[in-house]
Amino acid sequence: EVEKTACPSGKKAREIDESLIFYKKWELEACVDAALLATQMDRVNAIPFTYEQLDVLKHKLDELYPQGYPESVIQHLGYLFLKMSPEDIRKWNVTSLETLKALLEVNKGHEMSPQVATLIDRFVKGRGQLDKDTLDTLTAFYPGYLCSLSPEELSSVPPSSIWAVRPQDLDTCDPRQLDVLYPKARLAFQNMNGSEYFVKIQSFLGGAPTEDLKALSQQNVSMDLATFMKLRTDAVLPLTVAEVQKLLGPHVEGLKAEERHRPVRDWILRQRQDDLDTLGLGLQGGIPNGYLVLDLSMQEALS
C-alpha cells in the first residue's frame, strides 16, 4: 500500500507523459489521477516505467474499478498486464479478439503464465467455443496451446478450426487428446485428394483407428517412421506385414532400428516370423512357424 501524501506543487500530472518517468512511488500515487490514467492507458506503454511504478499505476486502476476493468482499459494495459493476478483477470469480460491479441503480444517470450491461462479461459468461455480465429491466434502465440486442453475442452473445437492447426501445435499432445482431434481433422480434410489429405492428416494420426490405417496403406502414402512410432499401439497391432510395408513404403527399413520400441515391438510379437522374414530386415520375435494363434478376445466375445 502506498501512503496518501499531498502532491507537491507543480507536479500534478495533466497527462500521462514522459515527465512521470522519474516520479517516486508516492509522487505517482499523489499526482496522477486514476480517471486520467484510465483514459490515457495507451500512453503508459510508451514510457519505460519500472515494476515499482507499474505497481502504483495498477493500484490506482484497482481503486477506480473495484469490480474489474472495462475492456477499453484492458485493451491498452500493455506491460501493466504482467502485474495482474488471475484473481484480477477473473473479474474481466474480454470479448474482442483484438484485446486478446494485444495482451498475448505483451506476454510474448514468456511461458504461458496462470494470468494468460485465466485470460484465455475467460475469453473462450465468453465465446462459447474455440472458433478458428481464436485458435489461430492462440496457437500462433503458444504452439502447445491445444495440447494443454483436456479431451473434454477439445470436444468444443469445431472441425473448421482444425485448418489453423500446424504440426508443431500437436507435438506435446497425448493419445487421449489425439483421439478427440483425429475425427475432427478427418472431417475437416475429407474433400482433399490422397496425397494432400495425408500431408494434412499426418500429425493427427496418433488418434487414428486400425481401419483408417488400413485404408491409408492402400494409397502409397510412404509414412515416415516418426509418424508410425506415434500411432496407437492398439491400432497398429492388427495390421498385417503387407499392410505395414505398403503404409511405410521405402521407410519400412527403419523398422529394424525401432524393433525394441513400441508400437513396433508389440506389432512384431503378433506377426508370423515367416511373414516378417519377407521384409528381409532381420526382424526377430515373431510367432514361430507351425504355431497356432488364438485370439482369446474374439473367443470370449463369442461365448
Epitope: 515527465s19 510508451a46 514510457i47 519505460p48 519500472t50 515494476y51
Partner: antibody, heavy 119, light 106 residues
Framework: QVQLVESGGGLVKPGGSLRLSCAAS????????MSWIRQAPGKGLEWVSY????????YYADSVKGRFTISRDNAKNSLYLQMNSLRAEDTAVYYC????????????WGQGTLVTVSS | IQLTQSPSSLSASVGDRVTITCRAS??????LAWYQQKPGKAPKLLIY???SLESGVPSRFSGSGSGTDFTLTISSLQPEDFATYYC?????????FGGGTKVEIK
C-alpha cells in the same frame, strides 16, 4: 536491422572535455528512450545517463551529475554525450543503448567507444 | 538496489550445465534482465522479466527466480557461451547491474 554506432572517444587530459555521438538506424529513433552505459577496463557496467524520446526528461548517475550532458537530435537520428571536467575514473568504454521494448532494460547496444582520461 | 552475482568466475567444459546466481539487496519482483558479453564486444540481452527469453537467444539459456534470488542456467554449455554474464534490475530507478560472472573454459 537495428544499428547503433558510437564515435568521439579518445585520449583526453584530466579536466578536459569530449563529445560522444551515437548514430542510430534500423528503427524510428524519435520514438524511443536512449541510454549511455559505461564499463571501466576490466570492470562491470554502470548506467550513466538516460533521455526520453522527446529529450525533455533526463537522468544522470550521481557520479557524472553536473559534468555530463545528454542530448539527442531526432532529425539526425543521433544521441550525444557531452563530457566535461573529465577525471581518471571516467576512463571506460561508453556504450549507447536503446529501449526498443519501451522497458527499463537495454535491448540493443552499440559496439562502444573508448574514452581514456590520463595525463 | 545492489545486485550481487556469484560466483564471480567459474570454469566449465562444453556440455556442462552452468548456473549463475544474482541476489538483490531488496525484493525486485521479477524485474531482472540477464546479458552476455564477449571480450571486446557489447553486451547482448538474453533474458528479461527474470525468465523470458529474448528473441533469437538459444533455448539452452533459461532464467528463474523472483523477489531477491535469481538464476541464469545454461543447460549444455557450447563453445560460443564462454563469456561474462551480467544481471540488471529494473524494479526501480536508478537501474543497476551485478558485478558479472566470467565463464571460462576448464
Amino acid at each position: 536491422q537495428v544499428q547503433l554506432v558510437e564515435s568521439g572517444g579518445g585520449l583526453v587530459k584530466p579536466g578536459g572535455s569530449l563529445r560522444l555521438s551515437c548514430a542510430a538506424s534500423g528503427f524510428t529513433f524519435s520514438d524511443y528512450y536512449m541510454s549511455w552505459i559505461r564499463q571501466a577496463p576490466g570492470k562491470g557496467l554502470e548506467w550513466v545517463s538516460y533521455i526520453s524520446s522527446s529529450g525533455s526528461t533526463i537522468y544522470y548517475a550521481d557520479s557524472v551529475k553536473g559534468r555530463f550532458t545528454i542530448s539527442r537530435d531526432n532529425a539526425k537520428n543521433s544521441l550525444y554525450l557531452q563530457m566535461n571536467s573529465l577525471r581518471a575514473e571516467d576512463t571506460a568504454v561508453y556504450y549507447c543503448a536503446v529501449h526498443l521494448k519501451r522497458r527499463p532494460y537495454f535491448d540493443y547496444w552499440g559496439q562502444g567507444t573508448l574514452v581514456t582520461v590520463s595525463s | 538496489i545492489q545486485l550481487t552475482q556469484s560466483p564471480s568466475s567459474l570454469s566449465a567444459s562444453v556440455g556442462d550445465r552452468v548456473t549463475i546466481t544474482c541476489r538483490a539487496s531488496q525484493g525486485i519482483s521479477s524485474a531482472l534482465a540477464w546479458y552476455q558479453q564477449k571480450p571486446g564486444k557489447a553486451p547482448k540481452l538474453l533474458i528479461y522479466d527474470a525468465s523470458s527469453l529474448e528473441s533469437g537467444v538459444p533455448s539452452r539459456f533459461s532464467g528463474s527466480g523472483s523477489g531477491t534470488d535469481f538464476t541464469l542456467t545454461i543447460s549444455s554449455l557450447q563453445p560460443e557461451d564462454f563469456a561474462t554474464y551480467y544481471c540488471q534490475q529494473f524494479n526501480s530507478y536508478p537501474l543497476t547491474f551485478g558485478g558479472g560472472t566470467k565463464v571460462e573454459i576448464k
